[in-house]
C-alpha cells in the first residue's frame, strides 16, 4: 500500500529562551519534488496553523520572514525550530507533510510533539 507516515518526538522541552526544536521525518511513497511542511498547534479541540513552508527537494526550507519557525531539510527529514515561545504556548505541535508535486498528492500527519514551555524566573533586583 502506498501510504505516507510522519514521525516526530512525543515530548520536547523548550529552552529557557523559549526555543524548541524537533525533527519531523516522513516516509515518502513516491519521488516528490515539491513538499509542503506545516506546523499545527492543537489546544483543546482547536487547531491553528503556526507556520508553513514549501520547498523543492534538495533546496533549503524557507519560512516567511515574519514566521516564528525556521528549519532545514535533509532528504525525508525536516529539522524544525520554533522561537518566541512562552508558557501559554505549551501544547501539542503537529507536523503535517504534503507531497505537492508530481501527482499524486499525498498527505501525512504526525501524532504531535507536546512542547512544554516554562517562563524563566525574573532576575531579582540586586542592591549594590
Amino acid at each position: 500500500c502506498k501510504a505516507m507516515h510522519v514521525a516526530q518526538p512525543a515530548v520536547v522541552l523548550a529552552s529557557s529562551r523559549g526555543i524548541a526544536s524537533f525533527v519531523c521525518e516522513y516516509a515518502s511513497p513516491g519521488k516528490a519534488t515539491e513538499v509542503r511542511v506545516t506546523v499545527l498547534r492543537q489546544a483543546d479541540s482547536q487547531v491553528t496553523e503556526v507556520c508553513a513552508a514549501t520547498y523543492m527537494m534538495g533546496n533549503e526550507l524557507t519560512f516567511l520572514d515574519d514566521s516564528i519557525c525556521t528549519g532545514t531539510s535533509s532528504g525525508n527529514q525536516v529539522n524544525l525550530t520554533i522561537q518566541g515561545l512562552r508558557a501559554m504556548d505549551t501544547g501539542l505541535y503537529i507536523c503535517k507533510v504534503e507531497l505537492m508535486y508530481p501527482p499524486p498528492y499525498y498527505l501525512g500527519i504526525g501524532n504531535g510533539t507536546q512542547i512544554y514551555v516554562i517562563d524563566p524566573e525574573p532576575c531579582p533586583d540586586s542592591d549594590f
Epitope: M4, V47, T48, E98, Y106, L107, G108, I109
Partner: antibody, heavy 118, light 108 residues
Framework: QVQLVESGGGVVQPGRSLRLSCTAS????????MDWVRQAPGKGLEWVAV????????YYADSVKGRFTISGDSSKNTLYLQMNSLRAEDTAVYYC???????????WGQGTLVTVSS | EIVLTQSPGTLSLSPGERATLSCRAS???????LAWYQQKPGQAPRLLIY???SRATGIPDRFSGSGSGTDFTLTISRLEPEDFAVYYC?????????FGPGTKVDIK
C-alpha cells in the same frame, strides 16, 4: 465565522462554458486547500478539483480533466471553476469546500445548480 | 484510485436505536485519512468525523468513527430524529479524493 458562498450556476447548452465563483470569508484563504465537489440530481458526492495554498498546484478528477480549470484570487478571497465543453453529465449542484487543517472538508458552501441541456 | 463501498445502501431504524454504517476501501487508506459526512435533503454535507475517529467541531458524542486499513465504521449510538439523513465516507490521504456512494438512514 467561516462562510463560503457560491454563484454563477444556471442553464447552459452542451459544449458551452460557464464560470462558477465561491467567495470565502472568515479565514486566511492561502492557508487552506480549496475544493469543488459536485452532486448530480438524486446521486452521491463526486470530488471535482482542488487548488492548494499559493495556487501553483491543482488536481482534477479524470471526468473533468482538460475541460475544467480551478483557480483562486487570494486578494478577493475567491475560488473559481471555469467549465468548458460542458456535457449533460456535468449537470449537478456544485459545492465549494474548504480542506480542514487535519483533513476532511470542514466547511461547505450552499451549492449552485448547473444544468446542461439543449 | 481508491474506490469506497458503503453498506448497507439503506438502513431503516427507529429513534433511540443504534446505527452501524460500514465503509470499505479497495486498498488501504493512507494513515486512516478517512472522513464521514452527513447530508440532509436540500442541504450541503456536514463533516462529522475526520482521521477515521476524530469528531469535528460541534459534533455530538453519539457519533463515533472507528476502523483502519480498508474497513471503517460510523456508529450513531442512539438515533435522534435529526440524524435521519444520508451518510458518506471519503478518503483524503491521496489524490484523487474519493467518496463512497452513501448510506441512507431512514425512519422505520
Amino acid at each position: 465565522q467561516v462562510q463560503l458562498v457560491e454563484s454563477g450556476g444556471g442553464v447552459v447548452q452542451p459544449g458551452r462554458s460557464l464560470r462558477l465563483s465561491c467567495t470565502a470569508s472568515g479565514f486566511t484563504f492561502s492557508s487552506y486547500g480549496m475544493d469543488w465537489v459536485r452532486q448530480a440530481p438524486g446521486k452521491g458526492l463526486e470530488w471535482v478539483a482542488v487548488i492548494w495554498y499559493d495556487g501553483r498546484n491543482k488536481y482534477y478528477a479524470d471526468s473533468v480533466k482538460g475541460r475544467f480549470t480551478i483557480s483562486g484570487d487570494s486578494s478577493k478571497n475567491t475560488l473559481y471553476l471555469q467549465m468548458n465543453s460542458l456535457r449533460a453529465e456535468d449537470t449537478a449542484v456544485y459545492y465549494c469546500a474548504r480542506g480542514g487543517l487535519l483533513g476532511g472538508f470542514d466547511y461547505w458552501g450552499q451549492g449552485t445548480l448547473v444544468t446542461v441541456s439543449s | 484510485e481508491i474506490v469506497l463501498t458503503q453498506s448497507p445502501g439503506t438502513l431503516s431504524l427507529s429513534p433511540g436505536e443504534r446505527a452501524t454504517l460500514s465503509c470499505r476501501a479497495s486498498q488501504s487508506v493512507s494513515s486512516n485519512y478517512l472522513a464521514w459526512y452527513q447530508q440532509k435533503p436540500g442541504q450541503a454535507p456536514r463533516l462529522l468525523i475526520y482521521g477515521a475517529s476524530s469528531r469535528a467541531t460541534g459534533i455530538p458524542d453519539r457519533f463515533s468513527g472507528s476502523g483502519s486499513g480498508t474497513d471503517f465504521t460510523l456508529t450513531i449510538s442512539r438515533l435522534e430524529p435529526e440524524d435521519f439523513a444520508v451518510y458518506y465516507c471519503q478518503q483524503y490521504g491521496s489524490s484523487p479524493f474519493t467518496f463512497g456512494p452513501g448510506t441512507k438512514v431512514d425512519i422505520k
